[in-house]
């Protein structure tokens, strides 16, 4: 990695005059669970925790639920969606279900979102077992501009799991574009 | 990357004095399939190779099944579980399995466990295909303090595929704390 | 991280002299649509983009569908690779698919390949929906050596999804080897 | 409901300026990005620029670079539009609109009610 | 820029007829396409969005299709209230740009 290049306008020797420079930017981002919308169709995720629990941000913003990059560089971006079902909340709203999350990147430079990464699973829950739980993962290494901003879309939003180690999406800096 | 300063104690200025600053922490620590608990209940896994294939620990150590952080940072954390089922091995516990995994911090300062991560799935096991394969994969950014622990809790031990390709758990360190 | 010491033969005083290195090894592939294999035998996919869309490579080679490593070091890998199926595609090869992938090393001084990661799951696609969708993530933390390849090996690449955001592999140098 | 109104018709001569407002109501302002897009008498529909209202990002149509400065004010959930060296050729009917980025739409809705906008020496 | 060229720009129907408008793209812009109604005097409406979805509200006679540089809005039985300038938009990339429009009167 380029390590603290990525945050400086000078040189290596600057940095070394200078001391530690700034953090390089990171978020790791939990779901608001008293903000999960309803419904079964598709829908972005508005509302993200950025300081309790596991959640964290550093030279990152969040903002109507969209993680916006302040500082141009390559990101390890990631996603971890979790749906689950008790036959005690009622029936799913079809047996077969597609369980579905995109990471999506939108910017004031592009009209339309483009879908980053996606990942999921169609799924029978219908009777038989009274508990069902299912989790996707995905992640991948992108350049992202300042000004950009990340968000997370999902099927079925009425079957996440609200627990801050089950649905959450993050970032980290990993070098500087040249 | 705050790159070097997360792993001295001086200035930038010491380190291109001294030259190379120490590698950053790490593990990525593989099954051991001798060890591997039976049953269908919730287990820790307290056994896991880190010196041979493709396991291996730098400024980390690891302890009863337990991976312990020897110096603050950010790390990114990740765990790939795999199930397999043979006819041939007899029947599953259960035909509605929850194949789940859980990535754990302990702390000698928090008396109890705390969940980072997990994922999985409820499948049906049942009859009609002689061979069932399950993978799971989570992976997220957190913060960790020297002394803090990470442990791999899994539901059905005895259905882990044990290769070294299928069932490991690592970890890296990103940055610094400021 | 190590940062730049990963990329310079010389001391951390010769960085600060010289200003920023050279950007660390990183790569992002992304499935050519035009060449999935049929079938569904276990292949390795042997095409994929570097240029185009989020694809991208530096420091690295993308050489018939291999990923070449030109720098020692540990690397953090990745793998996202989706299977879908519509009714209107014709049936699927068999109602008890095996969806699996395989993340592999070569080395020309190694004749065999070794699986670094696996992830998958069986899966039952006979009839009762039109549509059917599955996705893998794996990642990991491992050393690699110049010369070394990176490759996927998918069973049923008939089904893979096309999309750039289903399907796709990379990897990023976190830090140098001591 | 989900609403944008605009300020009304204007009246300008070559060379100078004119500044639209479209006041939103009815949702988050800062949550969707604002859209200007102007129609000429008898034509068709030209696209000016964009401001995301949470943070001030704007991008504009090339033709107009130099000439249109969009702006908003978070305050009063008001996004405005200013067109400087008005020349005949910008008598149009000005339309701010909303871009739905929340569910995945992407298109325009709704519109203004559109103010008119006449060059005349 | 990306140009959207609209036909026919103008169109004579009877009520109940099936009505049919093109639009094609100078390039490739996925489904990132929308269809807009617009009355004499007012702001234009969104009836269709990503090619082939259409918008809460609007009735099921309207229909959008298409993919990559080639797309179509059908309205299967023209109503009284349908009469009306109908333009097609991409969202692919900026500047956004729309077709000349389809102007549809009555027969």
């Known amino acids: 990695f380029s390590g603290a290049p990525a945050m400086m306008e000078g040189s290596w020797l600057d940095v070394a005059q200078r001391g530690k420079p700034e953090a390089q930017p990171f978020a790791h981002l939990t779901i608001n669970a008293a903000s999960i919308p309803s419904g079964s169709h598709k829908v972005t995720l508005s509302s993200w925790y950025h300081d309790r629990g596991w959640a964290k941000i550093s030279n990152m913003t969040l903002s109507n639920g969209k993680l916006r990059v302040n500082q141009d560089g390559f990101y390890y971006l990631y996603a971890n969606i979790c749906f689950r079902h008790h036959e005690t909340s009622g029936s799913v709203p079809t047996d077969y279900l597609q369980l579905m999350v995109y990471v999506v990147k939108t910017s004031i430079k592009i009209p339309s979102s483009h879908n980053l990464m996606k990942g999921g699973s169609t799924k029978n829950w219908s009777g038989n077992s009274e508990f069902h739980f299912y989790s996707i993962n995905v992640g991948g290494f992108f350049k992202l501009r300042a000004g950009e901003e990340i968000s997370i879309q999902v099927s079925n939003p009425s079957l996440l799991d609200p627990d801050q180690d089950a649905t959450y999406f993050g970032a980290f800096k990993v070098q500087d574009i040249d | 990357f705050s790159g070097a300063p997360a792993m001295m104690e001086g200035s930038w200025l010491d380190v291109a004095q001294r030259g190379k600053p120490e590698a950053q922490p790490f593990a990525h620590l593989t099954i051991n399939a001798a060890s591997i608990p039976s049953g269908s209940h919730k287990v820790t896994l307290s056994s896991w190779y880190h010196d041979r294939g493709w396991a291996k620990i730098s400024n980390m150590t690891l302890s009863n099944g337990k991976l312990r952080v020897n110096q603050d940072g950010f790390y990114y954390l990740y765990a790939n579980i795999c199930f397999r089922h043979h006819e041939t091995s007899g029947s599953v516990p259960t035909d509605y399995l929850q194949l789940m995994v859980y990535v754990v911090k302990t702390s000698i300062k928090i008396p109890s466990s705390h969940n980072l991560m997990k994922g999985g799935s409820t499948k049906n096991w049942s009859g009609n295909s002689e061979f069932h394969f399950y993978s799971i994969n989570v992976g997220g950014f957190f913060k960790l303090r020297a002394g803090e622990e990470i442990s791999i809790q899994v539901s059905n031990p005895s259905l882990l595929d044990p290769d070294q390709d299928a069932t490991y758990f690592g970890a890296f360190k990103v940055q610094d704390i400021d | 991280f190590s940062g730049a010491p990963a990329m310079m033969e010389g001391s951390w005083l010769d960085v600060a002299q010289r200003g920023k290195p050279e950007a660390q090894p990183f790569a992002h592939l992304t499935i050519n649509a035009a060449s999935i294999p049929s079938g569904s035998h276990k292949v390795t996919l042997s095409s994929w983009y570097h240029d185009r869309g989020w694809a991208k490579i530096s420091n690295m080679t993308l050489s018939n569908g291999k990923l070449r490593v030109n720098q020692d070091g540990f690397y953090y890998l990745y793998a996202n690779i989706c299977f879908r199926h519509h009714e209107t595609s014709g049936s699927v090869p068999t109602d008890y698919l095996q969806l699996m992938v395989y993340v592999v090393k070569t080395s020309i001084k190694i004749p065999s390949s070794h699986n670094l990661m696996k992830g998958g799951s069986t899966k039952n696609w006979s009839g009762n929906s039109e549509f059917h969708f599955y996705s893998i993530n794996v990642g990991g933390f491992f050393k690699l050596r110049a010369g070394e390849e990176i490759s996927i090996q998918v069973s049923n690449p008939s089904l893979l999804d096309p999309d750039q955001d289903a399907t796709y592999f990379g990897a990023f140098k976190v830090q140098d080897i001591d | 409901q989900v609403q944008l109104v605009q300020s009304g018709a204007e009246v300008k001569k070559p060379g100078s300026s004119v500044k639209v407002s479209c006041k939103a109501s009815g949702y988050a302002f800062t949550n969707y990005y604002i859209e200007w897009v102007r129609q000429a008498p008898g034509q068709g529909l030209e696209w000016m620029g964009v401001?995301?209202?949470?943070?001030?990002?704007?991008n504009y149509n090339e033709k107009f670079k130099g000439r249109v400065t969009i702006t908003a004010d978070k305050s009063t959930s008001t996004a405005y539009m200013e067109l400087s060296s008005l020349r005949s050729e910008d008598t149009a009917v000005y339309y701010c609109?909303?871009?739905?980025?929340?569910?995945?739409?992407?298109?325009?809705?709704?519109w203004g009610q559109g103010t008119t906008v006449t060059v005349s020496s | 820029d990306i140009q959207m060229t609209q036909s026919p720009s103008s169109l004579s129907a009877s009520v109940g007829d099936r009505v049919t408008i093109t639009c094609k793209a100078s390039q490739n812009v996925g489904t990132n396409v929308a269809w807009y109604q617009q009355k004499p005097g007012k702001a234009p409406k969104l009836l269709i969005y990503?090619?082939?979805y259409r918008y809460s509200g609007v009735p099921s006679r309207f229909s959008g299709s298409g993919s990559g540089t080639d797309f179509t809005l059908t309205i299967s039985s023209l109503q009284p209230e349908d009469f009306a300038t109908y333009y097609c938009?991409?969202?692919?990339?900026?500047?956004?740009?729309f077709g000349g429009g389809t102007k549809v009167e009555i027969k």
């Open positions: 609109a909303r871009r739905d980025t929340a569910h995945g739409y992407y298109a325009l809705d709704p």
């Open positions: 938009q991409q969202y692919w990339d900026y500047p956004l740009t």
């Open positions: 990503s090619a082939s």
């Open positions: 401001i995301n209202p949470g943070w001030g990002d704007t």
